[in-house]
Interface confidence: medium
């Protein structure tokens, strides 16, 4: 089997010119492509591998929501050769955002890692951004974190920080097959140059207070931090927006929340070859867009195409 | 209908300056990853210099780099390259060219840069 | 001198079938980039002939092909006609250079 090969961690590392072609190794049957989406209020950028694969040919993607960051994941794996150009690499409106003057700034501020590599991502390093409020959503919060995506036996892992609508996160997750976005919270100007080393606090349960030595020992209390659940996989056909049904007014994990599950019928992965600037092109800048638009999504058509690296 | 039209090119003594443009239309400009391309009169393609969509990744090739500049506007449609400290050696058309099918896929008409003392 | 190498010049008569060599090296063309091809009319830009190795555009006839195999690629023309009589050039990414570059060129004369 041969397959295209590539690595993207949100530059140009999948682009037409950069495409490669590789011959899987024995016993391997599909070829793989998948591509991780995170939006912020001000920006948004992708990570992508496409390579020899495992596993069984179809496709599954997924839209998730952590605290008013927005992902989306999609996979497609299948069996003939050099398949794997289906998937829209990049996103197609928001990147950078555009008219943030638009908008009017709530005064929180905090430190913006939208594509940046993992050395332009640290401590006070990367853009300082005015957060403001979107779309009815309050984003007054900071946060510090990280996209991952694992393909094809190559892990692309990418820093994340920006404005959520949450300020005492504490290593919240939300998860797709082989995708991963993660990270904490804070509040307070550019509080988020490195939340690595949080601590889980909730409001719900008191903080831990030095008394006196008791006569009696004390029961005692620990947090539980339940963002390890994974979710289970979409229908192949369908885009499924994860998102709470309720304001994230509490400081639990997502996981922890009703989730109402939207399905978009029709949402195929496969698309015409519209390369890396071709029809439904490579993803860039636009005016921002209103941010309950999960259309500005990739993957609704048009194919991106495979470059350098790779399996 | 994908249209690129270049502007600006014209007679410069070396060691002057030049603002290419090649206005896009017919497509959506801030999606495509798009690059300049130039010939010598009488000579092969060589490609010059590339930019992705958003702006964000910039290559040039060795022969203009450190006095070419690519740059786009998304909001205007229109893709330049900055040429100074220009040579002879520089005398070309200049197309500009989108990025598309793999390839690039839709070319300018060109726009000839001629430098002479 | 280019990166990848193409015989200057190339002939055949209409009907017959000419093919033109480009040959690259571990860098470009033998590193997995994949070929395309471009074709330059007298006094007009070029245009995308074949893309990913064997691949071709709508509107292009299926007179042209084409073919890789390790550090080399090749351009098949079957049928020749009048009006392929044009420059042909091969292009590939160049890990090296991290840029694409192109062939020198060959230029095709269809004769009679």
């Known amino acids: 089997l041969e397959c295209y090969s590539c690595v993207q961690k949100a530059d140009d590392g999948c682009s037409p010119h950069r495409m490669k072609t590789v011959k899987c190794g024995p016993g391997v049957d599909v070829c793989t492509e998948a591509v991780g989406a995170v939006e912020t209020i001000h920006g948004q950028f992708s990570v992508a591998v496409r390579g020899c694969g495992s596993g069984i040919p179809g496709k599954n993607d997924r839209g998730l929501d952590l605290h008013g960051l927005l992902a989306f994941f999609q996979l497609q794996q299948c069996s003939e050769d050099r398949c794997n150009a289906k998937l829209n690499l990049t996103l197609r409106g928001l990147n950078p955002a555009g008219n943030e003057s638009a908008y009017e700034p709530n005064g929180a501020e905090c430190y913006s890692c939208v594509g940046l590599s993992r050395e332009k991502c640290q401590g006070s390093m990367p853009p300082v951004v005015n957060c403001y409020n979107a779309s009815g959503r309050v984003y007054k919060g900071c946060f510090d974190g990280n996209v991952t995506l694992t393909a094809a036996n190559v892990t692309v892992s990418l820093p994340v920080r920006g404005c959520v609508q949450d300020e005492t996160c504490t290593r919240d997750g939300v998860t797709g097959p082989g995708f991963t976005l993660s990270g904490s919270c804070c509040q307070g100007p550019r509080c988020n140059a490195d939340l690595r080393n949080k601590t889980y606090f909730s409001p719900r349960i008191p903080p831990l207070v030095l008394l006196p030595p008791p006569t009696t020992a004390a029961p005692s209390t620990r947090a539980q931090n339940s963002s390890s659940t994974t979710s289970t996989a979409a229908p192949t056909t369908t885009t499924s927006i994860i998102k709470p049904t309720t304001a994230q007014a509490s400081h639990t994990s997502p996981h922890e929340m009703d989730l109402e599950v939207i399905q978009e019928e029709g949402a195929s992965l496969s698309g015409g070859a519209a390369g890396h600037g071709g029809t439904a092109g490579h993803g860039g800048a636009a005016g921002h867009q209103d941010r309950s638009n999960m259309e500005k999504y990739p993957g609704k058509g048009g194919a991106q195409i495979p470059a350098k690296g790779g399996s | 209908e994908v249209q690129l039209l270049e502007s600006g090119g014209g007679l410069v003594q070396p060691g002057g300056s030049l603002r290419l443009s090649c206005a896009a239309s017919?497509?959506?400009?801030?999606?495509?990853?798009m690059s300049w391309v130039r010939q010598a009169p009488g000579k092969g393609l060589e490609w010059v210099s590339y930019?992705?969509?958003?702006?964000?990744?910039?290559y040039y090739a060795d022969s203009v780099k450190g006095r070419f500049t690519i740059s786009r506007d998304n909001s205007k449609n229109t893709l330049y390259l900055q040429m100074n400290s220009l040579r002879a050696e520089d005398t070309a058309v200049y197309y500009c060219?989108?990025?598309?099918?793999?390839?690039?896929?839709?070319w300018g008409q060109g726009t000839l840069v001629t430098v002479t003392s | 001198q280019s990166v990848l190498t193409q015989p200057p010049s190339a002939s055949g008569t209409p009907g017959q079938r000419v093919t033109i060599s480009c040959t690259g090296s571990?860098?470009?063309?033998?590193?997995?980039?994949?070929v395309h091809w471009y074709q330059q009319l007298p006094g007009t830009a070029p245009k995308l002939l074949i893309y990913?190795?064997?691949k071709r555009p709508s509107g292009v006839p299926d007179r042209f092909s084409g073919s890789k195999s390790g550090t080399s690629a090749s351009l098949a023309i079957s049928g020749l006609r009048s009006e392929d009589e044009a420059d042909y050039y091969c292009?590939?990414?160049?890990?090296?250079?991290?840029?694409?570059?192109f062939g020198g060129g060959t230029k095709l004369t269809v004769l009679g």
């Open positions: 292009a590939a990414w160049d890990d090296r250079l991290n840029g694409p570059v």
């Open positions: 990913d190795n064997n």
């Open positions: 017919g497509f959506t400009f801030s999606s495509a990853w």
């Open positions: 060219a989108r990025e598309g099918l793999w390839a690039f896929d839709y």
């Open positions: 930019i992705s969509s958003s702006g964000s990744t910039i």
């Open positions: 571990s860098s470009n063309i033998g590193a997995g980039y994949v």
